[in-house]
Amino acid sequence: ARNGDHCPLGPGRCCRLHTVRASLEDLGWADWVLSPREVQVTMCIGACPSQFRAANMHAQIKTSLHRLKPDTVPAPCCVPASYNPMVLIQKTDTGVSLQTYDDLLAKDCHCI
Amino acid sequence: ARNGDHCPLGPGRCCRLHTVRASLEDLGWADWVLSPREVQVTMCIGACPSQFRAANMHAQIKTSLHRLKPDTVPAPCCVPASYNPMVLIQKTDTGVSLQTYDDLLAKDCHCI
């Protein structure tokens, strides 16, 4: 159950998709990736207040226990719910190849 | 790729499975669950230092960008990689039923 999408902390403060521009050097990929030279990395960033985009029952439990024991149980965390695939032109032992990675770019986000 | 399982922060400090004992009241379930009265909630807690139990390529990217831009990109987060199902005896409109929940108890953990 994807719970409430209303952010009580104010617009854009809660768990959502952000885009961060990164070079191959930033990513530590310069020695094995040829293209693209720059990646628009989509990632999940933001707070997960009570029941905001709760991914499942476990996330709801975590919210309840965090409220009771904030020093022991962390709040739910903003992570990808699904991914967009991306192709990289990479160096391999046998030469250059196009390789698709299914778990590279976040597509949407939830709290867990 | 599940990367290194060695925790550089010291034993038990990194992302791993913890058990937290919680009553129905703690969980806010007292009005709809009859049994169990107490749940041994298994959850994922701990730090995610560089490449520790990285769930996928996205987690590796997040680690690299967090190192570069710690104020913009958060570190990867310790979340369930899979779940153990659990049965609850719950109240329904028509009486009592046994309901299995697949996403309630964390089985193992990774960083994402």
């Epitope: 040829l34 293209s35 693209p36 967009n84 695939p85 991306m86 192709v87 990289l88 032109i89 250059v96 190849s97 196009l98 698709t100 770019l105 | -």
Partner: antibody, heavy 118, light 107 residues
């Protein structure tokens, strides 16, 4: 296994519109960085890049032909289309589609031949 | 448009020889050059990407070199199956452009 196959009318008369289809398998145009390009080659001559379309619907055309070209895609059916209006004998050529990852034509179709004749 | 010039339309060689196909860009294209091989009646096949990186599965007798404006495809120990036409292509800027091709034939 990645494959691409072009299909077209084979023969057209001058001033007609050429409609080409590239049907592919083994990759998806939902993948960031992935595209399909059209390239042509008159018999015994060199290669000329015509157009390409990327996963995000970004379209690029060769300026020398831009006013006559339209590229489009049907991602769910794994097809890319190219229309060339007002064909002339100079458009007689083999037409290829190629998988394009970040501007690299790594795998090409077998080609389809167009003859423009009155 | 960036013009890619392959000055030699034909090159004669013998099996076992070493041959170098050259390509010159009309402006600096960095290492944004690919090479393709086309045999008669077939579609082109990728050989080299980013000026010097062999495409997966391409025999190591094919070597690409160069950057900026001058590029070379070298074939060492030429085999009979290497008799084909070779095209360079730049992907530094649009429109993407090819050289006119160099045909490798037997002496």
């Amino acid at each position: 296994q990645v494959t691409l196959k072009e299909s077209g009318p084979g023969i057209l008369q001058p001033s007609q519109t050429l409609s080409l289809t590239c049907s592919f398998s083994g990759f998806s145009l939902n993948t960031s960085g992935m595209g399909v390009s059209w390239i042509r080659q008159p018999s015994g001559k060199g290669l000329e890049w015509l157009a390409h379309i990327y996963w995000d619907d970004d379209k690029r055309y060769n300026p020398s032909l831009k006013s006559r070209l339209t590229i489009s895609k049907d991602t769910s059916r794994n097809q890319v289309f190219l229309k060339i209006t007002g064909v002339d004998t100079a458009d007689t050529a083999a037409y290829y589609c190629a998988r394009t990852g970040w501007d690299f034509f790594d795998i090409w179709g077998q080609g389809t031949t167009l003859t423009v004749s009155s | 448009d960036i013009v890619m010039t392959q000055s030699q339309k034909f090159m004669s060689t013998s099996v076992g020889d070493r041959v170098s196909v050259t390509c010159k860009a009309s402006q600096n294209v960095g290492s944004n050059v690919a090479w393709y091989q086309q045999k008669p009646g077939q579609s082109p096949k990728a050989l080299i990407y980013s000026a010097s990186y062999r495409y997966s599965g391409v025999p190591d007798r094919f070597t690409g070199s160069g950057s900026g404006t001058d590029f070379t495809l070298t074939i060492t120990n030429v085999q009979s199956e290497d008799l084909a036409e070779y095209f360079c292509q730049q992907y530094k800027s649009y429109p993407l452009t090819f050289g006119a091709g160099t045909k490798l034939e037997l002496k």
